[in-house]
Each structure stands twice: as structure tokens, then as C-alpha cells.
């Protein structure tokens, strides 16, 4: 974020230049934050969509947004907002979020490509030992949920623990 602060586009409060913070930053709208996925552009005096700068200079405020945008363009990957990282769906199929459903469901149709533990799960040999060995482990406890890719298969909180946000 620029030191000028960020402005909520569409805000109507007038900036009075007599009013200042000690640091010399203007008060009023220039100190308010922009809506999510926008940044304050001090030269435009406006909140702008982060999309406008992802291909240019990745301004601090937009860094996570721009990373998630480029991640979403990569097939078989999704952006995890808690990890702030681009995750390969291939590495978490079976304990995957909805963003990976298409990729993982297609992958699961050819069992040859599956790791041994998932092949066992598909053939009914579901082991009930939640020993934190889930490939994608807990960031957020959601309790026991059915895997979107394997209906009926219950996963432990440790295995599920996903951020289901796009």
C-alpha cells in the first residue's frame, strides 16, 4: 500500500487539506481502505482493481491477489489463501478442496495414476487411522466431511482442513 493510504471508490467524504496527521498524510478518504482486491493509487487518487497491475508492478497490497490470479490460470492448481501458496491438485487428490474437484475426479477415473493409499480407498479398503498422515493437513478444523471426489468416504479433520475459497 502506498503511504497515501487507500480510498474506498465511490466514497463521498471530502478531504480537507487543512486537516493532517502529524506524518503529513492527508486525512479523510485518503486514509480509508479500498474494497478487497483493490489498491489505492496515489497518482490517480482512486481505488483501482488489482487486476490492472498484476501484469506490471505487483504492488504490495495486491501481491496475494495477483499470485492467486496467476495460480488460477494454471491447470491443476489452486490458490490457498491461508497458506498463501499455489497448491498442485495432484498432490492432494482425495483430500482436496472444490477447486480441485474437476482435476481430481478426472484423475481418479484412471486408478493407475493413483497413489497406493487412494487405490485402496477406492476398492473399499478405507483405513480408519487418522494419524495426521493426510497429504494436505489441517489449517482449519472443519470436523469430519465427505470428500467431494470420493462420495461416502469420510476424512478426518486433519485430512480435510482446507480453505474452500476461490
Amino acid at each position: 500500500m502506498s503511504g497515501l493510504g487507500r480510498s474506498r471508490r465511490g466514497g463521498r467524504s471530502r478531504v480537507d487539506q487543512e486537516e493532517r496527521f502529524p506524518q503529513g498524510l492527508w486525512t479523510g478518504v485518503a486514509m480509508r481502505s479500498c474494497p478487497e482486491e483493490q489498491y489505492w493509487d496515489p497518482l490517480l487518487g482512486t481505488c483501482m482493481s488489482c487486476k490492472t497491475i498484476c501484469n506490471h508492478q505487483s504492488q504490495r497490497t495486491c501481491a496475494a491477489f495477483c499470485r492467486s490470479l496467476s495460480c488460477r490460470k494454471e491447470q491443476g492448481k489452486f490458490y490457498d489463501h491461508l497458506l498463501r501458496d499455489c497448491i498442485s491438485c495432484a498432490s492432494i487428490c482425495g483430500q482436496h478442496p472444490k477447486q480441485c474437484a474437476y482435476f481430481c475426479e478426472n484423475k481418479l477415473r484412471s486408478p493407475v495414476n493413483l497413489p497406493p493409499e487412494l487405490r485402496r480407498q477406492r476398492s473399499g479398503e478405507v483405513e480408519n487411522n487418522s494419524d495426521n498422515s493426510g497429504r494436505y493437513q489441517g489449517l482449519e478444523h472443519r470436523g469430519s466431511e465427505a470428500s467431494p471426489a470420493l462420495p461416502g468416504l469420510k476424512l478426518s479433520a486433519d485430512q480435510v482442513a482446507l480453505v474452500y475459497s476461490t
Epitope: 503511504g3 497515501l4 471530502r14 498524510l25 493509487d41 490517480l44 482512486t46
Partner: antibody
Framework: QVQLVESGGGVVQPGRSLRLSCAAS????????LHWVRQAPGKGLEWVAL????????YYADSVKGRFTISRDNSKNTLYLQMNSLRAEDTAVYYC???????????WGQGTLVTVSS | DIQMTQSPSSLSASVGDRVTITCRAS??????LGWYQQKPGKAPKRLIY???SLQSGVPSRFSGSGSGTEFTLTISSLQPEDFATYYC?????????FGGGTKVEIK
């Protein structure tokens, strides 16, 4: 393409007023903030004022605060600078400027000369 | 207000020379800085934005670096058309402030 064309400059006596205009084309005028920047003869650049896209927020250099008013008419795609109580030190070329901080967007008008002299 | 101190105020150089211009901010401004070139009777032209990003259409011999309070504009191999005055601009806080300028003259 983006065009910014200033007008309204001229010779004016100290203490009098003048209004500069900047006609804009080639971009969505009502979406962006615009600036006035000036340059006294043989001197450097001095930022004067900025107005937000909707005119609700205005920022001024200390040297013009209380004397100059920046405004805009989005229906006419025009930026204005109302200059009151003019002083000799306001003599300069005044540029209309439109720029973005983190993208390559940066456009300037050709400038209009204001001379404050008795 | 943030003061931008530019140095040198003028320099003489030959075609092919490497030229470095420095801008120092009176307080930290992150990378909220641009570099402008101006020729007599013309409007300024931006060369660099966000301290180090090259403006589209600007030759790659121009480069910017720095963050915080110290910034540099480098022309790797001076060309005849580069003889001009260069300004830095901080946009970290209002009022926006330009450096005093550096005039690059032919030796």
C-alpha cells in the same frame, strides 16, 4: 489515443484571477484522478493539485492552498484550475497530467503559459 | 512534506558513457517513486515508475533502482537523444514532490 489539451493561459496582473482548462479525450475521464503541475521559466517541476475521479477529494501544494481551486466537469471531460490572488511567483507553464502509480499509464498535456506581471 | 534531493544538479558526459543520477528522500517512501525526462519546451516524459519498472516504449538502457530513501536512475550507454533534464517524483504522500532536477549536458 489519450489527449490532454490545456487552455486559458495568458498575461494577468498580480492579485487578479485566471481559469485554466484541460480538455481530455481518449480515456474514461470520469474514472480517474487528474493533476496540475507547473514549471516556472528555467526552473524545475512543481506539483500543484490533484482531484479525484468524482471531484469529491482535492489535494493541493502548500504554495497554492487557499488561492487555487481544482475542479472537473465529467460531462464535458474537462479539468479546471481556478487561480485567484495571483502572484509573480505563479508565473509558469501549467501542465495537465494523468498518471498511474504502478502501471505504465502516464500522459501530459502540452502546457499553457501563465504570466503574472504588472 | 517530503523533500527530494537530487544529485548532481548537472553533469557533462559523452555519448556511450554510463550515467548515474541519485535521488534521496527526506523519509522512507518505499518504492513510490518515478523518474522523468524533460527536453526544452516539451512536457515531461516518464521513464521509470515504482522505482524500478521501465515505462513502456522506453529504451532498456534506462534503469531504476532503490527503495526507502535512496534511489538511482542509470543510463547504461548515453545516446545523443538522452541529453535532457531528469527529475524524480515521490508519490508516497501528498503533497507530491519532485527532485530539483539533473541536467545532462554534452561534454
Amino acid at each position: 489515443q489519450v489527449q490532454l489539451v490545456e487552455s486559458g493561459g495568458g498575461v494577468v496582473q498580480p492579485g487578479r484571477s485566471l481559469r485554466l482548462s484541460c480538455a481530455a479525450s481518449g480515456f474514461t475521464f470520469s474514472s480517474y484522478g487528474l493533476h496540475w503541475v507547473r514549471q516556472a521559466p528555467g526552473k524545475g517541476l512543481e506539483w500543484v493539485a490533484l482531484i479525484s475521479y468524482d471531484g469529491s477529494n482535492k489535494y493541493y501544494a502548500d504554495s497554492v492552498k487557499g488561492r487555487f481551486t481544482i475542479s472537473r466537469d465529467n460531462s464535458k471531460n474537462t479539468l479546471y484550475l481556478q487561480m485567484n490572488s495571483l502572484r509573480a511567483e505563479d508565473t509558469a507553464v501549467y501542465y495537465c497530467w494523468y498518471s498511474s502509480s504502478w502501471t505504465p499509464l502516464d500522459y501530459w498535456g502540452q502546457g499553457t503559459l501563465v504570466t503574472v506581471s504588472s | 512534506d517530503i523533500q527530494m534531493t537530487q544529485s548532481p544538479s548537472s553533469l557533462s558526459a559523452s555519448v556511450g558513457d554510463r550515467v548515474t543520477i541519485t535521488c534521496r528522500a527526506s523519509q522512507g517512501i518505499r518504492n513510490d517513486l518515478g523518474w522523468y525526462q524533460q527536453k526544452p519546451g516539451k512536457a515531461p516524459k516518464r521513464l521509470i515508475y515504482a522505482a524500478s519498472s521501465l515505462q513502456s516504449g522506453v529504451p532498456s538502457r534506462f534503469s531504476g533502482s532503490g527503495s526507502g530513501t535512496e534511489f538511482t536512475l542509470t543510463i547504461s550507454s548515453l545516446q545523443p537523444e538522452d541529453f535532457a533534464t531528469y527529475y524524480c517524483l515521490q508519490y508516497y504522500s501528498y503533497p507530491l514532490t519532485f527532485g530539483g532536477g539533473t541536467k545532462v549536458e554534452i561534454k
